[in-house]
């Protein structure tokens, strides 16, 4: 029986150009975590394997950093990064637990004002 629960950072927002930490935590189970997969919609961003460590998608290696812990740090955020992110915990003997995070990337108000007003 799967007794565990995943706690996530839930719905979060961040500014364009900034960075954000995506964090999930598996609790209420003694199951062994064998691998954690981080996905954005249908795209695999990163894997953290219990034995073999972190693996980052080549498409994201310049903008994704492993950690802290089993979390994932997204850097140099763009508006296109807005959307759903999933942490998928593969465990033994329980099976698979999935957590969902919604990230909204907002236009920086500083950047907007900087573009509109020029100092003569």
């Amino acid at each position: 029986m799967m007794t565990g629960t995943i706690e996530t950072t839930g719905n979060i927002s961040a500014e364009k150009g900034g960075s954000i930490i995506l964090q999930c935590h598996l609790s209420s189970t003694t199951a062994q975590v064998t691998q954690v997969n981080w996905e954005q919609q249908d795209q695999l961003l990163a894997i953290c394997n219990a034995d073999l460590g972190w693996h980052i998608s080549p498409s994201f290696k310049d903008r994704v950093a492993p950690g802290p812990g089993l979390g994932l740090t997204l850097q140099s955020l763009t508006v296109n990064d807005t959307g759903e992110y999933f942490c998928i915990y593969h465990t033994y003997p329980d099976g698979t637990y999935t957590g969902r995070i919604f990230l909204e990337v907002l236009e920086s108000s500083v950047a907007e004002h900087g573009a509109r007003f020029q100092i003569p």
Epitope: Q35, L44, N49, H55, P58, H90
Partner: antibody, heavy 117, light 106 residues
Framework: EVQLVQSGAEVKKPGASVKVSCKAS????????IYWLRQAPGQRLEIMGR????????YFVDKFKNRATITTDTSASTAYMELSSLRSEDTAVYYC??????????WGQGTLVTVSS | DIQLTQSPSFLSASVGDRVTITCKGS??????LVWYQQKPGKAPKLLIY???NLQSGVPSRFSGSGSGTEYTLTISSLQPEDFATYYC????????FGQGTKVEIK
Amino acid sequence: EVQLVQSGAEVKKPGASVKVSCKASGYTFTEHSIYWLRQAPGQRLEIMGRIDPKNGRTYFVDKFKNRATITTDTSASTAYMELSSLRSEDTAVYYCARIDGFYFDFWGQGTLVTVSS
Amino acid sequence: DIQLTQSPSFLSASVGDRVTITCKGSQNVNKYLVWYQQKPGKAPKLLIYSTDNLQSGVPSRFSGSGSGTEYTLTISSLQPEDFATYYCYQYNNGFTFGQGTKVEIK
């Protein structure tokens, strides 16, 4: 053109150690992890471990944690795998492979290691 | 970790035949499946990644499909150079290989 070239076949006695080399060319050596895998006769390919040439950090599956050592010489773009306390069941073809994200895109040609008394 | 079982283990075929190899996972592989070709004494060669993406330089007669636990590699018209052993590999949970399918000349 990416190439991984391994050292030649070895015959070892039980209890001995073997060190296999893997020379990489055609890409920036520090930008990809190198994995070591093996295939014993009639068995499937199995992963032994990994090294990140950028920082020398190694990772091993449980089965090989106490017997395998993986190192690199970044100046020579070469990875090494040493397996100690050899036994007959270590007779296998040993491969190095470059990982690109989540899968192996280029492999060495394999090195046959025979353990026999 | 996910166990992969390929079928058949051996396959006899003729040049021009359409060949299909199946790879079944013990759990959902989530399309994180790769196919390799290996010839005797040679390094394995990447054919297909992420279930259905053809690696650069691989002939279009090779194709991959599948979802969930079942995946297939298809060679639409077998060529003399295609006689080899084929392996599937998954990375959804652990990093594991199938036992291989040897394609021999009939």
